[in-house]
């Protein structure tokens, strides 16, 4: 067979799938590694050719789409199963193809099991809600293409293994869930079941969404420099270990990049020669307000060290804030004999 | 740890209720559903009801719908079970139990309360 | 609802043999199925959930098995703390339903 751009293992497309359900799955070439679509492709006479590799298998197979039932079918660019099996777990190639011209990509498909609080070992999209915001709503995911407009579905909402009939705060409203004021005791994992008639015969697409409800962009604030403060100062006598830590308070904000950092003398502490050392921990409420740590640490400090400026800086979408700590050498102690018998007058 | 901690024995004369409460400690208690399940003198074990304290929601056996109510109060982590127009088969020992909402076993049970009922 | 049939009623055994237990669904439940032991004067404690898997704590003589109808919960080696009595418990479909229970008793 004459040479086919190999786009390999789309490992990026690791598609899973419950068991007993429709899938639709369409293939990647068109979406992620080509530059033109199935229709342009298709009129330009080339034709979409699938197979597959079982699980812990080689041997690369045709697909069978002459199962009963049309279990397994193709439409355009996407393979349909109607519904999946366990045992159809593993990886599918799509071939794009004609005389002069082949693409292929492969991808892995697994096909996995929920019980019936429907756990499942299925990766789960993460829906975040403002705390105490108002009315918001999540829609069941990943359901479009199943079945014609003309098609009324019926949808039943579940919070783990309980269906969602008269909750005090979140009413099912066909494909949406609307949360009327989302409180920390929401955060969850939130299920639609979508069933469907189709040829005489009902489906269920089943989607499991995690709800993490954050901190209100409303109650949202600049950095936050709890030290260093005016009420500490790092007294130091050379020689000795001068740790200062920076902690810094970031209300949650969506897509906010919060960095804290050094300056030392006006300068990153990579630019200047002293031997310094820094390491950070973070901490996380459960709103997801973020504290930031960075410990600065010189282990033998000098008398030049002790004079320098030492600022903390914090920054997020919210604004940009520093904090110098008070450094200063300490006064050594008077030494009794000399300095004490000095001060009396003694010659 | 938790615990779920029971109220103590009752006996009621038939036709009135009873109601039997249930205090957890040792855990969120908003961050799980209580359970309800009775066991008559010598016999199995019966499920009963829950509700989800966090939301308000409850539900019911079909057996015993419209004799049944539970409840829960938030601010003192406590769930209750009321059974009215009591007969003498509803002499049981009842037993609120702890369901984290993603499971559907129960991992923690309380002591269990002693409900006689007798003319 | 759901029926669960649990069987022998009472298993008469010596300590050190082993003991299984069997527990049928009146239809299918597939892996949501939980095994309870009780004493006298005691509330349940769980031992088994999702057919197979031991609770925090419980030793590894006990083991689950099956799946969709047909269910067994086996004490390898039985041990003096371990004659009670065992319920089976599905919640594949509201409402949960239990086995009767069957009596583990020295013999």
């Known amino acids: 067979s004459e040479r086919c751009d190999d786009w390999g293992l789309d490992t990026m497309r690791q598609i899973q799938v419950f068991e007993d359900e429709p899938a639709r799955i369409k293939c990647p070439l068109f979406e992620h590694f080509l530059k033109f679509n199935y229709s342009t492709a298709h009129s330009a006479g080339l034709t979409l050719i699938w197979y597959w590799t079982r699980q812990d298998r080689d041997l690369e197979e045709p697909i069978n789409f002459r199962l009963p039932e049309n279990r397994i079918s193709k439409e355009k660019d996407v393979l349909w199963f109607r519904p999946t099996l366990l045992n159809d777990t593993g990886n599918y190639t799509c071939m794009l193809r004609n005389t002069t011209y082949c693409s292929k990509v492969a991808f892995p498909l697994e096909v996995v099991q929920k019980d019936s609080c429907f756990n499942s070992p299925m990766k789960l999209p993460v829906h975040k809600l403002y705390i105490e915001y108002g009315i918001q709503r999540i829609t069941c995911p990943n359901v479009d293409g199943y079945f014609p407009s003309s098609v009324k579905p019926t949808i039943t909402w579940y919070m783990g293994c309980y269906k969602i009939q008269n909750f005090n705060n979140v009413i099912p409203e066909g494909m949406n869930l609307s949360f009327l004021i989302a409180l920390i005791s929401n955060n969850g994992n939130y299920t639609c079941v979508v069933t469907y008639p189709e040829n005489g015969r009902t489906f269920h697409l089943t989607r499991t969404l995690t709800v993490k409800v954050v901190g209100s962009p409303k109650n949202a604030v600049p950095p936050v420099i709890h030290s260093p403060n005016d009420h500490v100062v790092y007294e130091k006598e050379p020689g000795e270990e001068l740790l200062i830590p920076c902690t810094v308070y970031f209300s949650f904000l969506m897509d906010s990049r919060n960095e804290v950092w050094w300056t030392i003398d006006g300068k990153k502490p990579d630019d200047i020669t002293i031997d310094v050392t820094i390491n950070e921990s973070i901490s996380h409420s459960r709103t997801e307000d973020e504290t930031r740590t960075q410990i600065l640490s010189i282990k033998k400090v000098t008398s030049e060290d002790l004079k320098r400026s030492y600022v903390c800086h914090a920054r997020s979408a919210k604004g940009e804030v520093a904090k110098a700590a008070k450094v200063k050498q300490k006064v050594p102690a008077p030494r009794y004999t000399v300095e004490l018998a000095c001060g009396f007058g003694a010659t | 740890q938790v615990q779920l901690v029971q109220s103590g024995a009752e006996v009621k004369k038939p036709g009135s209720s009873v109601k039997v409460s249930c205090k957890a400690s040792g855990g969120q208690f908003n961050d799980y559903a209580i359970h309800w399940v009775r066991q008559a003198p010598g016999q199995g074990l019966e499920w009963m009801g829950y509700i989800i304290p966090a939301y308000g929601q409850a539900e019911y056996a079909q057996k015993f719908q419209g004799r049944v109510t539970i409840t829960a109060d938030e601010s003192t982590s406590t769930a209750y079970m009321e059974l009215s127009s009591l007969r003498s088969e509803d002499t049981a020992v009842y037993y609120c139990?702890?369901?984290?909402?993603?499971?559907?076993?129960?991992?923690?049970w309380g002591q269990g309360t002693l409900v006689t009922v007798s003319s | 609802e759901i029926v669960m049939t649990q069987s022998p009623a009472t298993l008469s055994v010596s300590p050190g043999e082993r003991a299984t237990l069997s527990c049928r669904a009146s239809q299918s439940v597939s892996s949501n199925l939980a095994w309870y032991q009780q004493k006298p004067g005691q509330a349940p404690r769980l031992l088994i959930y999702?057919?197979?898997t031991r609770a925090t704590g419980i030793p590894a003589r006990f083991s689950g098995s099956g799946s969709g109808t047909e269910f067994t919960l086996t004490i390898s080696s039985l041990q003096s703390e371990d004659f009670a009595v065992y319920y089976c418990?599905?919640?594949?479909?509201?409402?949960?339903?239990f086995g009767q229970g069957t009596k583990v008793e020295i013999k």
């Open positions: 999702g057919a197979s």
């Open positions: 139990a702890r369901v984290p909402y993603s499971t559907a076993y129960f991992d923690y």
């Open positions: 418990q599905q919640y594949n479909n509201w409402p949960w339903t």
